[in-house]
Amino acid sequence: VFIFPPKTKDVLTITLTPKVTCVVVDISQNDPEVRFSWFIDDVEVHTAQTHAPEKQSNSTLRSVSELPIVHRDWLNGKTFKCKVNSGAFPAPIEKSISKPEGTPRGPQVYTMAPPKEEMTQSQVSITCMVKGFYPPDIYTEWKMNGQPQENYKNTPPTMDTDGSYFLYSKLNVKKETWQQGNTFTCSVLHEGLHNHHTEKSLSHSPGK
């Protein structure tokens, strides 16, 4: 039995619905019945959505139950527990999850233009440095002129010397796209920020 936290973007975007997920694997087809119970701070709740078991390539079954949660319950550190009953288990299996403890610290966000040495290439790199945040759960994406971009890679959050975390995000764009003066925005979601969101933009200035 495995329990998974909600997606960071879902927790930090008020209009989305975060879900805690409980997954049971290696269920025998001879004894496929699995019953999920969910608890928030040890109070049972009945709002989970449990999917029909799915057959896996190794002929076992996999069963998934998702509990939609309130953003604040996760951010305020409540504990979510999934209890799984099955005839195949000698006793129910319980798995719990909650947000890491500690005081949230919002990141500082800095954008950096392509280095001039890179301007000989057909593709150039726009970089976003996100530093000083805690906990490490963060969502970083890029936009060009307000439109989401896909050609970027984020490093995993890495612990810094002060116990906070940092990451770098690199967006690849065609050199011409950069030189045309389009606006590139590094957009960051983190619980330590006002409304969980901040963004920093940059664009090419002629003569620079």
Epitope: L12, T13, I14, T15, L16, T17, H71, R72, L75, H194, N195, H196, H197
Partner: antibody
Framework: EVQLLQSGPELVKPGASVKIPCKAS????????MDWVKQSHEKSLEWIGY????????IYNHKFKDKATLTVDKSSNIAYMELRSLTSEDTAVYYC??????????WGQGTTLTVSS | DIKMTQSPSSMYASLGERVTITCKAS??????LSWFQQKPGKSPKTLIY???RLVDGVPSRFSGSGSGQDYSLTISSLEYEDMGIYYC?????????FGGGTKLEIK
């Protein structure tokens, strides 16, 4: 730059309805709720409710449940509040406000509604 | 509904003076409290959220404190541009509710 642009003043007759638009720009419309607030001389500020533009879900202050209907047009990034069966008590300034996890970081400029025969 | 009682309802203060406005909730609101400033003919502007966090761009002379049912907004040294009406708002429970406002004027 985040902007919420509301329509100009409205003068309507008692018993009529009015639909107030709030045009959002400068952010991803579906990432934030849109709240609506009434400001009248008698009752200061009152929260009417909000709509989630992503899902269309609404939550209303029970006092406004039969008075206001909140909708959105995602294709044009406009939130609407319709007020019905208007009386002189509905005379007020109505604001839209972008609602994130922390309340109301950006507000519209307000729409003044006057109900008079 | 949670009732938010703000005091004083109006006050005069001198430039450079330290000013404190209070807001009392009818029940614990878990620090989900915001403070707004409104100038005549303008929309409210958020100053403080979650009881004590300053919104980016708001001068550091503004600060918020409190927990449970009792909260306060303090202006450490009053400036002319601070006059206006100040409102608190609880965001802990629906319906969200505002305090009645404090009108701050310069002596």
């Amino acid at each position: 730059e985040v902007q919420l642009l509301q329509s100009g003043p409205e003068l309507v007759k008692p018993g009529a309805s009015v639909k107030i638009p709030c045009k959002a720009s400068g952010y991803t419309f579906t990432d934030y709720n849109m709240d609506w607030v009434k400001q009248s001389h008698e009752k200061s500020l009152e929260w009417i409710g909000y709509i989630n533009p992503y899902s269309g879900d609404t939550i209303y202050n029970h006092k406004f449940k039969d008075k206001a209907t909140l909708t959105v047009d995602k294709s044009s990034n406009i939130a609407y509040m319709e007020l019905r069966s208007l009386t002189s008590e509905d005379t007020a300034v109505y604001y839209c406000a972008r609602g994130g996890y922390d309340y109301g970081d950006h507000w519209g400029q307000g729409t003044t509604l006057t109900v008079s025969s | 509904d949670i009732k938010m009682t703000q005091s004083p309802s109006s006050m005069y203060a001198s430039l450079g003076e330290r000013v404190t406005i209070t807001c009392k909730a009818s029940q614990d609101i878990n620090s989900y409290l915001s403070w707004f400033q409104q100038k005549p003919g303008k929309s409210p502007k958020t100053l403080i959220y979650r009881a004590n966090r300053l919104v980016d761009g708001v001068p550091s002379r503004f600060s918020g404190s409190g927990s449970g049912q009792d909260y306060s907004l303090t202006i450490s040294s009053l400036e002319y541009e601070d006059m206006g009406i100040y409102y608190c708002l609880q965001d802990d429970e629906f319906p969200r509710t505002f305090g009645g406002g404090t009108k701050l004027e310069i002596k």
